[in-house]
Amino acid sequence: KESCDVQLYIKRQSEHSILAGDPFELECPVKYCANRPHVTWCKLNGTTCVKLEDRQTSWKEEKNISFFILHFEPVLPNDNGSYRCSANFQSNLIESHSTTLYVTDVKSASERPSKDEMASRPWLLYR
């Protein structure tokens, strides 16, 4: 029997490589049974997670799961970093794994390691 607790299914150790200037949607998969919980996004700053107020968010419903989406329109260089979603459910705070955005600023892309360099220097992948 599946649990009726709220579950936040951001993938553990997930990463997104995105370009500054592009639109991007960061999804928080949410499983719930009856009432949809109140979900928020925050951005990690050291050990604290700063709540993202006044940011465009929306819900998308799919079969068996819903998504609470944080919209980046467009992505800015300082959007680089780690994000987490959290839900209030029966006076409990449920926190997701964090997910990391690696933002490439197209203006300085030439200074960044190429795909070939990444392949020949695999330790660059373990940031």
Partner: antibody
Framework: EVQLQQSGADLVKPGASVKLSCTAS????????AHWVKQRPEQGLEWIGR????????KYDPKFQGKATMTADTASNAAFLQLSSLTSEDTAVYYC????????????WGQGTSLTVSS | EVVMTQTPLTLSVTIGQSASISCKSS???????????LNWFLQRPGQSPKRLMH???KLDSGVPDRFTGSGSGTDFTLKISGVEAEDLGVYYC?????????FGGGTKLETK
């Protein structure tokens, strides 16, 4: 029911490349990670790497970097492992493994694909 | 990379007897999220591996409660209280805290 169906056994010549497939049913690959695990005859298990089918992001064990390339296609709910410049060292069973919602806990295993590299 | 060392290599038991397998990691497997990503798998002859235990001590669905997992940091143990014939095979520990993820070398559980 969650199932991972892997492509059939393959016999290939040294120096060639091969692409193994893994098709998921009972869940959406987009919401999971797909891992690949190698097992040489009478040997233990080796983690090759994992792919996030939602965005193509990959992580490899450095010893498989350049040998293995993982890809995924969310439209067909499938993950793929390409192995290049094959040698007898690549003779093994390759397992496709999926996580429950990207938990990184290796929840569901395919039946394995036996690859033999021989001239 | 994190090295996972399993002992013993082979464990010969009588059916009904208890068995214990040790797994040691070269560094602590406690993740920053407070969880320890240590799993145990059983591979029966001719079959795919099957997960028995995740996050050190959480028993997987359908796995009998004669299996118990314990440990923390770098030292982990899988205990089987009263081995049954269906328990025979090769047991692997695995860490998913650090990239690259790594398996232990395996412990073969066989009958005397």
């Amino acid at each position: 029911e969650v199932q991972l169906q892997q492509s059939g056994a393959d016999l290939v010549k040294p120096g060639a490349s091969v692409k193994l497939s893994c098709t998921a049913s009972g869940f959406n690959f987009k919401h999971t990670y797909a891992h690949w695990v190698k097992q040489r005859p009478e040997q233990g298990l080796e983690w090759i790497g994992r792919i996030d089918p939602a965005n193509g992001n990959t992580k490899y064990d450095p010893k498989f970097q350049g040998k293995a390339t993982m890809t995924a296609d969310t439209a067909s709910n499938a993950a793929f492992l390409q192995l290049s410049s094959l040698t007898s060292e690549d003779t093994a069973v390759y397992y496709c493994v999926a996580d429950h919602y990207g938990s990184s806990l290796l929840d569901y295993w395919g039946q394995g694909t036996s690859l033999t590299v021989s001239s | 990379e994190v090295v996972m060392t399993q002992t013993p290599l082979t464990l010969s038991v009588t059916i009904g007897q208890s068995a214990s397998i040790s797994c040691k990691s070269s560094q602590s497997l406690l993740d920053s999220d407070g969880k320890t990503y240590l799993n145990w798998f059983l591979q029966r002859p001719g079959q795919s591996p099957k997960r028995l235990m995740h996050l050190v001590s959480k028993l997987d669905s359908g796995v009998p409660d004669r299996f118990t997992g314990s440990g923390s940091g770098t030292d982990f143990t899988l205990k089987i209280s009263g081995v049954e014939a269906e328990d025979l095979g090769v047991y692997y520990c695995w860490q998913g805290t650090y990239f690259p993820y790594t398996f232990g070398g395996g412990t073969k559980l066989e009958t005397k």
